[in-house]
Interface confidence: medium
């Protein structure tokens, strides 16, 4: 399974999206970092 930062972040984004969560530029709900080099 893909467990790089990109994958983890995108999975979380999908979960928040499906649950009606809102993501703002100044709000980081979890750890993240190295997506596509």
């Amino acid at each position: 399974a893909c467990d790089t930062a990109t994958c983890v972040t995108h999975r979380l984004a999908g979960l928040l999206s499906r649950s009606g969560g809102v993501v703002k530029n100044n709000f980081v709900p979890t750890n993240v970092g190295s997506k596509a080099f």
Epitope: C2, T4, A5, T6, C7, T9, H10, L12, A13, V23, K24, N25, F27, V28, T30, N31, V32, G33, S34, K35, A36, F37
Partner: antibody
Framework: EVQLVESGGGLVQPGGSLRLSCAAS????????ISWVRQAPGKGLEWVAE??????????HYAEAVKGRFTISRDNAKNSLYLQMNSLRAEDTAVYYC?????????????WGQGTLVTVSS | EIVLTQSPATLSLSPGERATLSCKAS??????VSWYQQKPGQAPRLLIY???NRYLGIPARFSGSGSGTDFTLTISSLEPEDFAVYYC?????????FGQGTKLEIK
């Protein structure tokens, strides 16, 4: 303003050790996964290591070429990233960059430091 | 390890021309590919992420496409400041890998 500033590079003999630092500012350092990337003189880019966030127990990943010789670590209280390099070889000669990448919907962020040069030579 | 192969190694074009750079992955990487521009003495600059998304402040003449294993960076009309080295990179699997680079030079 986000800033990443590397330091600690220099000339070291083969078999020697060096510790690189990356001072971060302008963001909540402990929340982010962060990496070291290197570039040998006149060559391409090579990922070295990554450390995850505090909430991920600062788990680490390494390139095969450095596994067992290099250790990535972080001090969230000091907003600093480190790379302890042991048993250095000539092929480790490179500019070392710390790099932050965050992709979360609209919150796309990509930052690199200016790099610090490590030269391994006798 | 996922190997990224860029072509051509060198591309010689004139300002105003269209540049097409290719990146092929040895394994499927969905759209987890980025493109970077690097000039001598500088850190890489992110141009495209997620195969086709332009990063903040990147001019519209830069565009990316592809998915799976084949990816393309297109510069629609070259400006003098575009002559540099371009790298593709994947973040689908560890270790993160880069292509060997394409040098875009003035003809």
């Amino acid at each position: 303003e986000v800033q990443l500033v590397e330091s600690g590079g220099g000339l070291v003999q083969p078999g020697g050790s060096l510790r690189l630092s990356c001072a971060a500012s302008g963001f909540t350092f402990s929340n982010y996964w962060i990496s070291w990337v290197r570039q040998a003189p006149g060559k391409g880019l090579e990922w070295v290591a990554e450390i995850r966030s505090e909430s991920d127990a600062s788990a680490t990943h390494y390139a095969e070429a450095v596994k067992g010789r290099f250790t990535i670590s972080r001090d969230n209280a000091k907003n600093s990233l480190y790379l302890q390099m042991n048993s250095l070889r000539a092929e480790d000669t490179a500019v070392y960059y710390c790099r932050l990448y965050f992709d979360y919907g609209l919150a796309i962020q990509n930052y690199w430091g200016q790099g610090t040069l490590v030269t391994v030579s006798s | 390890e996922i190997v990224l192969t860029q072509s051509p190694a060198t591309l010689s074009l004139s300002p105003g021309e269209r540049a097409t750079l290719s990146c092929k992955a040895s394994k499927w990487v969905t759209t987890y590919v980025s493109w970077y521009q690097q000039k001598p003495g500088q850190a890489p600059r992110l141009l495209i992420y997620g195969a086709s998304n332009r990063y903040l402040g990147i001019p519209a003449r830069f565009s990316g496409s592809g998915s799976g294993t084949d990816f393309t960076l297109t510069i629609s009309s070259l400006e003098p400041e575009d002559f540099a080295v371009y790298y593709c990179s994947q973040s689908y699997n560890y270790p993160y890998t880069f292509g060997q680079g394409t040098k875009l030079e003035i003809k």
